[in-house]
């Protein structure tokens, strides 16, 4: 399809690296959420950090290419990494406009399918890129 994908764009303070160059930021007339029009894919992504009491968004934006998962209509996150004990990074990829604005659901920490608490540990910035 010819139309380009538009995704929510967000990068939490302190996150190393940026995916801003994967698209063109749009003027939406509001401060947040920001929107980005993808240059190299028709695929959005989102990364959330799930701890015992809350899920916090870490990054949202465009992927650099279309990959498995990008055909999904909704953001269905799956566990990817452990930035620190007690927290898990969940990522999603999806292929409709603003589909990365929020996730459909997150499994509770420690539930089946979530990497064990002895999974790989990484510095916060590094873990984001592991998740991507």
């Amino acid at each position: 399809p010819p139309n380009r994908r538009t995704c929510v764009f967000f990068e939490a303070p302190g996150v190393r690296g940026s995916t801003k160059t994967l698209g063109e930021l749009l003027d939406t007339g509001t401060e947040l959420p920001r929107a980005i029009r993808c240059l190299y894919s028709r695929c959005c992504f989102g990364i959330w950090n799930l701890t015992q009491d809350r899920a916090q968004v870490e990054m949202q934006g465009c992927r650099d290419s279309d990959e498995p998962g990008c055909e999904s209509l909704h953001c269905d996150p799956s566990p990817r990494a452990h930035p620190s004990p007690g927290s898990t990074l969940f990522t999603c990829s999806c292929g409709t406009d603003f589909c990365n604005a929020n996730y459909s659901h997150l499994p509770p920490p420690g539930s089946p399918g979530t990497p064990g608490s002895q999974g790989p540990q990484a510095a916060p910035g590094e873990s984001i890129w592991m998740a991507l």
């Epitope: 010819p2 749009l26 939406t28 929107a35 240059l39």
Partner: antibody, heavy 117, light 111 residues
Framework: QVQLQESGPGLVKPSETLSLTCTVS?????????WNWIRQFPGKGLEWMGY???????SYNPSLKSRITISRDTSKNQFFLQLSSVTAEDTAVYYC??????????WGQGTLVTVSS | DIVLTQSPSSLSVSVGDRATITCRAS??????????MHWYQQKPGQPPKLLIY???NLESGIPARFSGSGSRTDFTLTISSVQPEDFATYYC?????????FGGGTKLEIK
């Protein structure tokens, strides 16, 4: 600053494959940008042909999709155009261009390719 | 593909005059209110040079006498006071949809 330079044969025979090279200086083709080929026909019309991105993904104009291949050599900081089964209608000035966004801020000087027997 | 029609195809003006070139798209080139229309200047033997991006943003180093406006399907490039070095051919380009397409060009000539 980003500089681009096209090179390749100025004359190609009908039904053969047109091959051009774009050499980029002042910027790594793996750092960022889309690296495009654009041609300008003798009547002055411009046509975007396709790109290879910094990550190596490609996008082509559907009108050329069956004939075009864009590739790269990251060690030489070059990217390439191959256009197969050429006809006289492919005679044009061929430009390579770098784009951070979806417009073209950086252009080579262009090279004229004539398709003739 | 989106077809861009420029008018006029040629325009004769005197130095100091105001010049207006229009570009009409066969369908909207806006995404959520952002216009993906761009303008270039080309002189003989040279590649096109970016003047205006996203309808109204002046590229770095381009004189302020150049301006762009418009949205959806109708766009305008204006040169407020034409200078001798402005005599060239001008092209619009859309990037709202793949494939990117260009207008047929407007040649600005000396009257």
């Amino acid at each position: 600053q980003v500089q681009l330079q096209e090179s390749g044969p100025g004359l190609v025979k009908p039904s053969e494959t047109l091959s051009l090279t774009c050499t980029v200086s002042g910027y790594s083709i793996t750092s960022d940008f889309a690296w495009n080929w654009i041609r300008q026909f003798p009547g002055k019309g411009l046509e975007w042909m396709g790109y290879i991105s910094f990550s190596g993904s490609t996008s082509y104009n559907p009108s050329l999709k069956s004939r075009i291949t864009i590739s790269r050599d990251t060690s030489k900081n070059q990217f390439f155009l191959q256009l197969s089964s050429v006809t006289a209608e492919d005679t044009a000035v061929y430009y390579c261009a770098g784009s951070r966004y979806s417009w073209f801020a950086y252009w080579g000087q262009g090279t004229l390719v004539t398709v003739s027997s | 593909d989106i077809v861009l029609t420029q008018s006029p195809s040629s325009l004769s003006v005197s130095v100091g005059d105001r010049a207006t070139i229009t570009c009409r798209a066969s369908e909207s080139v806006d995404t959520y209110g952002n216009s993906f229309m761009h303008w270039y200047q080309q002189k003989p033997g040279q590649p096109p040079k970016l003047l205006i991006y996203r309808a109204s943003n002046l590229e770095s180093g381009i004189p302020a006498r150049f301006s762009g406006s418009g949205s959806r399907t109708d766009f305008t490039l204006t040169i407020s006071s034409v200078q001798p070095e402005d005599f060239a051919t001008y092209y619009c380009q859309q990037s709202n949809e793949d494939p990117y397409t260009f207008g047929g060009g407007t040649k600005l000539e000396i009257k």
